[in-house]
């Protein structure tokens, strides 16, 4: 029952072009280009851009001209491959061009980088973005498109034309108010954290359909979308499941216009149905259709019906189990994933499909048994270690974070994992900690029934942060278990890793610790990086050195800066007490 | 409207055949195991049989072998082919849903009922 | 398959009064036991499920206890609209289900 069966097109990109749009095919095509070919200049891009859409127009206006009947991926993929410096930026991404499709875009895919070798996005003066948005709006937003995308190469593409819109409205606001920065900074604050939340949430998705395949992401939309739509029946999550899976494969191997337009279907799809799907969905149809997928995306979770009888009798207590699952296997243990999901809006996602992978393997253990009944008839007394195990640690944690703050719990949490995994490189053990520690924000306010899903979910989406960063350059074998054994298992694994006896401590390298004036200048949050990459060197110097002694020293450390800050020649001050420090600092750890 | 619409019954000589349908509204049949029970005038509720999500049907050990359940999701609509019909099989059959996809009760949504009399 | 006896069979008693059902199975269904009402004419209603839960919309005065093999329907006030023939049904140990024969509640 999927809703996405049409009629097939003479022109695939005259078939996109008109059910998206001018202003959207445009948008999809560059942001699909920057993805792709993160390092190519903005006019570069915008000029294939502006190519690609003049061949879509001369094929809306006779879909069997020549080329017209080309696939999307044979008529992009031959576009990017005539940007004359693919070599020389590239590299072996060059050899990409010599192959066929499908293989020349599975190269291309596989050449996307998570972290890519670009500037920090600096943010001009207000005054200036203003000037830059009023003299010519088209080239600022298709800036920010740009600029977005080469920098996140996985982003939700239709989600990003929300974003823009968004983006927009806020200049045009705030250009025009009394003061324009208190208007509009704020406004970019937001899209930014929003901007990189989005993008780790989409980076998951992807992840888990490329390694793990259409099943595990299958079996997590399940979940998620029986916690959401606890009314719906079990045929109609399988339709947006089935549905869903459609529009994230699209989005995830490059097909931003399918997936955009599909994505559009299914929002209306949903919007039709909305009486077998959800009660909560009423506001979100009313609106436009950016913001109203978006707002589908990120709807409340309807009230679960009344009247569900206990689980046990059908996956437990029934002496026919055996006899379900042998005969429909995938109904079978979907239909346990959806009701177990339906009635548990208080766990977690992962935690979800845990159980699900339990029941799984208890049954296929037991129904080769001689007495096949009484071996899975305790099978729901396993899942009781399997939920404690992240209720205790979110308990454990939050105290935790009530007790330090959001900084300090960072540097907790810092330290934890610097001695867990020594080798990850500094950046992307700060970035990764930083984004663990603000769990604590995000999730600890809510009441117990919400803490699961807001905290084990999102330390999921921060975890492939970790795993998709690594796999770029490994340089551990337990990173790499953790990622790549089981994807719902990933948070556990890493709770459960202790400190890396077998690494050799880094050597000392005063360098490393020597700061210059610069650093009082630098916002709060830039601040707390710098002192927050000083305090991986000293875990990776001295791995064994207690809480106590870190503590110490980092304590130090802040009254140098702030004392050096204060100093009317701060660059001397930096240099002479930083040598004092660096000293004090090696005899507290023994170093 | 949720709701289930039972048809076909009627008077069948003994031996006959008859085909009763089960038409299902506003939810789909396919999530659910979907239930006959027969009910002999002044008599007890007797269950028939079910088929469930997984498309496996189960029977009440005295139904097997003469009736047979089977449903049409495009037409959402469930079947009860009975065969080798006699006087005891009078009754009203109701379709009734179950809880669940492979739940054998409780049944919360009932048909109601079609009336078939078998007399020569 | 297991067997559930209803008893009693009919019982007469007056509005205001308090009635209990027994229903009992030839061997444990643990708590997988409903109980519906059943007026002439129309299908059974759903009262009961899992022994002691009360489906929604349904009155308060309607309760259900018992696990194993020994299960009770009360009614802890009768209303004149309670008259009615009352089945216990088993359900959950396999793939069939088993119903009760009734018992008949009737003005006194």
């Known amino acids: 029952r999927g809703v996405f069966r049409r009629d097939a097109h003479k022109s695939e990109v005259a078939h996109r072009f008109k059910d998206l749009g001018e202003e959207n095919f445009k948008a999809l095509v560059l942001i699909a280009f920057a993805q792709y070919l993160q390092q190519c200049p903005f006019e570069d891009h915008v000029k294939l851009v502006n190519e690609v859409t003049e061949f879509a127009k001369t094929c809306v206006a006779d879909e069997s001209a020549e080329n017209c009947d080309k696939s999307l991926h044979t008529l992009f993929g031959d576009k990017l491959c005539t940007v004359a410096t693919l070599r020389e930026t590239y590299g072996e991404m060059a050899d990409c061009c010599a192959k066929q499709e499908p293989e020349r875009n599975e190269c291309f895919l596989q050449h996307k980088d998570d972290n890519p070798n670009l500037p920090r996005l600096v943010r001009p003066e207000v005054d200036v973005m203003c000037t830059a948005f009023h003299d010519n709006e088209e080239t600022f937003l298709k800036k920010y498109l740009y600029e977005i995308a080469r920098r996140h190469p996985y982003f939700y593409a239709p989600e990003l034309l929300f974003f823009a819109k968004r983006y927009k409205a806020a200049f045009t606001e705030c250009c025009q108010a009394a003061d324009k920065a208190a208007c509009l900074l704020p406004k970019l604050d937001e899209l930014r954290d929003e901007g990189k939340a989005s993008s780790a949430k989409q980076r998951l998705k992807c992840a888990s359909l490329q390694k793990f395949g259409e099943r595990a992401f299958k079996a997590w939309a399940v979940a998620r979308l029986s916690q959401r739509f606890p009314k719906a029946e079990f045929a109609e999550v399988s339709k947006l499941v089935t549905d869903l899976t459609k529009v994230h494969t699209e989005c995830c191997h490059g097909d931003l216009l399918e997936c955009a337009d599909d994505r559009a279907d299914l929002a209306k799809y949903i919007c039709e149905n909305q009486d077998s799907i959800s009660s909560k969905l009423k506001e979100c149809c009313e609106k436009p259709l950016l913001e109203k997928s978006h707002c589908i995306a990120e709807v409340e979770n309807d009230e679960m019906p009344a009247d569900l009888p206990s689980l046990a009798a059908d996956f437990v207590e029934s002496k026919d189990v055996c006899k379900n699952y042998a005969e429909a296997k995938d109904v079978f243990l979907g239909m346990f994933l959806y009701e177990y999901a339906r009635r548990h809006p208080d766990y977690s996602v992962v935690l979800l499909l845990r159980l699900a992978k339990t029941y799984e393997t208890t049954l296929e253990k037991c129904c080769a048994a001689a007495d096949p009944h009484e071996c899975y008839a305790k099978v729901f007394d396993e899942f009781k270690p399997l939920v404690e195990e992240p209720q205790n640690l979110i308990k454990q944690n939050c105290e935790l974070f009530e007790q330090l703050g959001e900084y300090k719990f960072q540097n907790a949490l810092l330290v934890r994992y610097t001695k867990k995994v020594p080798q990850v490189s500094t950046p992307t053990l700060v970035e990764v900690s930083r984004n663990l520690g603000k769990v604590g924000s995000k999730c600890c306010k809510h009441p117990e029934a919400k803490r699961m899903p807001c905290a084990e979910d999102y330390l999921s989406v921060v975890l492939n942060q970790l795993c998709v960063l690594h796999e770029k350059t490994p340089v551990s074998d337990r990173v790499t278990k953790c990622c790549t054994e089981s994807l719902v298992n990933r948070r556990p694994c890493f709770s459960a890793l202790e400190v890396d006896e077998t690494y050799v401590p880094k050597e000392f390298n005063a360098e490393t610790f020597t700061f210059h004036a610069d650093i009082c200048t630098l916002s709060e949050k830039e601040r707390q990086i710098k002192k927050q990459t000083a305090l991986v060197e000293l875990v990776k110097h001295k791995p064994k050195a207690t809480k106590e002694q870190l503590k110490a020293v980092m304590d130090d450390f802040a009254a140098f800066v702030e004392k050096c800050c204060k100093a009317d020649d701060k660059e001397t001050c930096f240099a002479e007490e930083g040598k004092k420090l660096v000293a004090a600092s090696q005899a507290a750890l023994g170093l | 409207e949720v709701q289930l619409v039972e048809s076909g019954g009627g008077r069948v000589q003994p031996g006959g055949s008859l085909r009763l349908s089960c038409a299902a509204s506003?939810?789909?049949?396919?999530?659910?195991?979907m239930n006959w029970v027969r009910q002999a005038p002044g008599k007890c509720l007797e269950w028939i049989g079910h088929?469930?999500?997984?498309?496996?049907?189960y029977y009440a050990t005295w139904a097997k072998g003469r009736f047979t359940i089977s449903r049409d999701n495009s037409k959402n609509t469930l079947y009860l082919q009975m065969n080798s019909l006699r006087a005891e099989d009078t009754a009203t059959y109701f379709c009734a849903r179950g809880a669940g996809g492979f739940s054998t009760g409780p049944f919360k949504l009932w048909g109601q009922g079609t009336q078939v009399t078998v007399s020569s | 398959a297991f067997e559930l006896t209803q008893s009693p069979s009919s019982l007469s008693a007056s509005v205001g009064d308090r009635v209990t059902i027994t229903c009992r199975a030839s061997?444990?269904?643990?708590?997988?036991l409903a109980w519906y009402q059943q007026k002439p004419g129309q299908p059974p209603k759903l009262l009961i499920y899992d022994a002691s839960d009360l489906t929604s919309g349904v009155p308060s005065r309607f309760s259900g206890s018992g696990s194993g093999t020994d299960f009770t329907l009360t009614i802890s006030s009768l209303q004149p609209e309670d008259f009615a023939t009352y089945y216990c049904q088993g359900y959950g140990g396999s793939s069939t289900t088993t119903f009760g024969c009734g018992t008949k509640l009737t003005v006194l």
């Open positions: 506003g939810f789909s049949l396919s999530s659910y195991a």
């Open positions: 088929i469930n999500a997984g498309d496996i049907a």
């Open positions: 061997e444990s269904i643990n708590s997988r």
